[in-house]
């Protein structure tokens, strides 16, 4: 806590300018009016204050706004944002996307800090949902943002926002997250024609159910192996050999290299060997002709 001392004669700040960098901490505290600072926050960023000096400026704002800063101040915090704690940020009410962008810019190039995570959380909660413009902004700064959300948080993403999602934004999503995002993507893209639809939906297919994979197999989509390997195992198991062949098109030959990995391995175990042989890939492990199929739950218990 900086001691309250009188401002030396002639040092009272009339405006926020470069002369203040020569002020000692106690002089800043005594000579800079908090209200002046609040109205001229946009100038702070252009002045090379030390970290200690920024601490004093933050302290002055905290005293002026004990319930949390107004958005007019928040928007111009600049590097002072890095001094904020998550507790400080929880007091804010940020509604403007411009404010969010300005603060994310300060943290650009760094990992998402607890401060940024809190800011985003406050902003999204304030808006009530993760709309397209917000998602556009967040994924531009943090491509992994979407996959950092819990399935519960993702459920607030409206289907219209899905248009903002790029394939790389989903790279680190796990199956539970894709389970939530896929139906939204399906709804968002369903007005497109078949081939355009597949291009858009492809990166979300890790959450697709069996029936949609079967429908895609009727569309000559030629799914690549990387996409196929990310599909839900339970969704792939009911696909017939003919359906997988149609789904993958020329990429079907890649099954051989993946025959020991999920979901290919488990899918092979559910197919008749005669059917697998029609692919001519030498896939082994299917059900011999005339054999009963054990229910999968029994197979699990036996292995």
């Amino acid at each position: 806590e900086v001691e309250k001392t009188a401002c030396p004669s002639g040092k009272k700040a009339r405006e926020i300018d470069e002369s203040l960098i020569f002020y000692k901490k106690w002089e800043l505290e005594a000579c800079v009016d908090a209200a002046l600072l609040a109205t001229q926050m946009d100038r702070v960023n252009a002045i090379p204050f030390t970290y200690e000096q920024l601490d004093v400026l933050k302290h002055k704002l905290d005293e002026l706004y004990p319930q949390g800063y107004p958005e007019s101040v928040i928007q111009h915090l600049g590097y002072l944002f890095l001094k904020m704690s998550p507790e400080d940020i929880r007091k804010w009410n940020v509604t403007s996307l411009e404010t969010l962008k300005a603060l994310l810019e300060v943290n650009k190039g760094h990992e998402m800090s607890p401060q940024v995570a809190t800011l985003i959380d406050r902003f999204v909660k304030g808006r009530g949902q993760l709309d397209k413009d917000t998602l556009d902004t967040l994924t531009a700064f943090y491509p992994g943002y979407l996959c950092s959300l819990s399935p519960e948080e993702l459920s607030s993403v409206p289907p219209s926002s899905i248009w903002a999602v790029r394939p790389q934004d989903l790279d680190t999503c796990d199956p539970r997250q894709l389970d939530v995002l896929y139906p939204k993507a399906r709804l968002a893209f369903q007005n497109m024609n078949g081939s355009e639809y597949f291009v858009k939906i492809q990166s979300f297919l890790g959450g697709a159910p069996t029936e949609d994979l079967k429908a895609l197999s009727q569309q000559n989509v030629s799914m690549d192996l990387a996409t196929f390997m990310k599909l839900r195992t339970d969704a792939v198991l009911p696909l017939t050999v003919a359906e997988v062949q149609k789904l993958l098109g020329p990429h079907v030959e890649g099954l051989k290299a993946e025959e020991r990995h999920r979901p290919v391995r488990d899918w092979i175990l559910r197919q008749r060997q005669d059917d697998l042989d029609t692919l001519g890939l030498g896939l082994q492990g299917g059900i011999p002709n005339g054999y009963l199929v054990l229910d999968l739950s029994m197979q699990e218990a036996l292995s």
Partner: antibody, heavy 122, light 107 residues
Framework: QVQLVESGGGVVQPGRSLRLSCAAS????????MHWVRQAPGKGLEWVAA????????YYADSVKGRFTISRDNSKNMLYLQMNSLRAEDTAVYYC???????????????WGQGTLVTVSS | EIVLTQSPDFQSVTPKEKVTITCRAS??????LHWYQQTPDQSPKLLIK???QSFSGVPSRFSGSGSGTDFTLTINSLEAEDAATYYC?????????FGQGTKVEIK
Amino acid sequence: QVQLVESGGGVVQPGRSLRLSCAASGFTFSSYGMHWVRQAPGKGLEWVAAIWYDGSNKYYADSVKGRFTISRDNSKNMLYLQMNSLRAEDTAVYYCARDLSIFGVVILSDYWGQGTLVTVSS
Amino acid sequence: EIVLTQSPDFQSVTPKEKVTITCRASQYIGSNLHWYQQTPDQSPKLLIKYASQSFSGVPSRFSGSGSGTDFTLTINSLEAEDAATYYCHQSSSLPWTFGQGTKVEIK
């Protein structure tokens, strides 16, 4: 919400024709495969016909092949079943149903109409 | 065409009892077998898709199993609202077909 409403049923003499309609709302009709399923009074379900989202492929049960024609008008969100050369055994409640998936004919969904009764009798 | 045979045709069960309905296909259909429930004067409702996948919103007491030619629908702890006719349905090959139905009555 999804709604399917059948109409066009009634009493008709053997050998005559009838056209059933199904008005769809609450979903993007042009993206879904559609089906007709029937149920004779006190009997089980019988799949009758299916059509792709764009009308490019049509499938029929053996019992109606050559007599019934399934069609759709995506601009009007309508599904149709033209039934010619009707027989007594065609007497049933006819349901229209949406496919569960988009861009294919894969599996009957949870969305069915309430049905329209067709009675073929002299 | 593929013929589906359900058994039993009729079952009278007391509430909380476990119900098992089987469906046998005349040829191999993989997992392309679905179960529907039809209550009197209502259109059918999808319960289980692809032999064992629960459809959204369906109570957890309904489960399905099987693959190939033999399939089972199980209702654990039957409730009064489960009184209905249950149909198995195959979408493995055209023409699609249904089983003849199993009527479940509450004692």
